[in-house]
């Protein structure tokens, strides 16, 4: 029976030319993680495997790097970057997990900026 | 004045499929994200999903994943949102609803479509 | 999927009244960057649900100054400091920091 539950970063509305950090935890199971994929909608952004290490998706090498810990830093971020994204945990022996995370990225003049881009 | 205005009504039979449509008016139709909102009869609002017209992304609430399918059409500034294999269950009012921008919120809604599931 | 209960489910009021409306979540609503995704909207009778309150306490465009939202984490309350006729109908909380958005169950505002 598969117990465990994924915690995320949360959704996260970020600003076009900054970076953020996406981030997934695994608890409540002693599962053993083989692997973790990063995915946005149908495109693998990047592999951590647990003996093999990280494989960045070669599209995405100048704009994502690996970490902190199982997570992705997304660097230098543009409009186009706005979408789900996924944290895929393949575990042994519950199986695969899977957490979700909804980036919005804002283009600096929007008005309707979270409170981290209001100029005081 | 932003706007968004739903087709009309809908009385289909079980089995089949709809397409509910939702014209935008007033804003950057691509500048934003479009949500969908069922409300069942007296029951409470549940989001089934959103698109994003720049980059045309989708995000589906799972429960509703095998259930609607979102488009959209930018030429006609205008969201579709399919309802498949319908059932009882499906009836209900379906609202879209542009995304306010940096706070994963909606802030302007249209006049709601009634689906109505009867053999 | 992240639960949002909302009490009470009805509130019978007069005219003038203040009143609170309770939202609680399953787990925190703040991300990673100390953001707090929680809104509040009213569904009059025969009208299209609107958008009262945005990230916990910003007012909407045009919302009067008595509505006011406050909390933080798990808790949130939608307090209307007089209620006047326009103000019954449905409210609801939807919380739109996990994946999937989900609403609270609506507090509905009634005469007594």
């Known amino acids: 029976m598969m117990t465990g539950t994924i915690e995320t970063t949360g959704n996260i509305s970020a600003e076009k030319g900054g970076s953020i950090i996406l981030q997934c935890h695994l608890s409540s199971t002693t599962a053993q993680v083989t692997q973790v994929n990063w995915e946005q909608q149908d495109q693998l952004l990047a592999i951590c495997n647990a003996d093999l290490g990280w494989h960045i998706s070669p599209s995405f090498k100048d704009r994502v790097a690996p970490g902190p810990g199982l997570g992705l830093t997304l660097q230098s971020l543009t409009v186009n970057d706005t979408g789900e994204y996924f944290c895929i945990y393949h575990t042994y022996p519950d199986g695969t997990y899977t957490g979700r995370i909804f980036l919005e990225v804002l283009e600096s003049s929007v008005a309707e900026h979270g409170a981290r881009f209001q100029i005081p | 004045e932003v706007q968004l205005q739903q087709s009309g009504p809908e009385l289909v039979k079980p089995g089949a499929s709809v397409k509910i449509s939702c014209k935008a008016s007033?804003?950057?139709?691509?500048?934003?994200?479009m949500n969908w909102v069922k409300q069942s009869h007296g029951k409470n609002l549940e989001w089934i999903g959103l698109?994003?017209?720049?980059?045309?992304?989708?995000s589906y609430n799972q429960k509703f994943k095998d259930k609607a399918s979102l488009t959209f059409d930018k030429s006609s500034s205008t969201a579709y949102m399919e309802l498949l294999s319908l059932t009882s269950e499906d009836s209900a009012v379906y609202y879209c609803a542009r995304g306010f921008r940096g706070y994963f919120a909606v802030d302007y809604w249209g006049q709601g479509t009634s689906v109505t599931v009867s053999s | 999927d992240v639960v949002v209960t909302q009490t009470p489910l009805s509130l019978p009021v007069s005219f003038g009244d203040q009143v609170s409306i309770s939202c609680k979540s399953s787990q925190s609503l703040t991300n990673s960057y100390g953001d707090t995704y929680l809104s509040w909207y009213l569904h009059k009778p025969g009208q299209s649900p609107q958008l009262l309150i945005y990230g916990i306490s910003n007012r909407f465009s045009g919302v009067p100054d008595r509505f006011s939202g406050s909390g933080s984490g798990t808790n949130f309350t939608l307090k209307i400091s007089t209620i006047k006729p326009e103000d019954l109908g449905v409210y609801s909380c939807?919380?739109?920091?996990?994946?999937?958005?989900?609403f609270g169950g609506g507090t509905k505002l009634e005469i007594k």
């Open positions: 939807l919380q739109g920091t996990h994946q999937p958005w989900t």
């Open positions: 007033g804003y950057s139709f691509t500048g934003y994200t």
């Open positions: 698109i994003i017209p720049y980059n045309g992304g989708t």
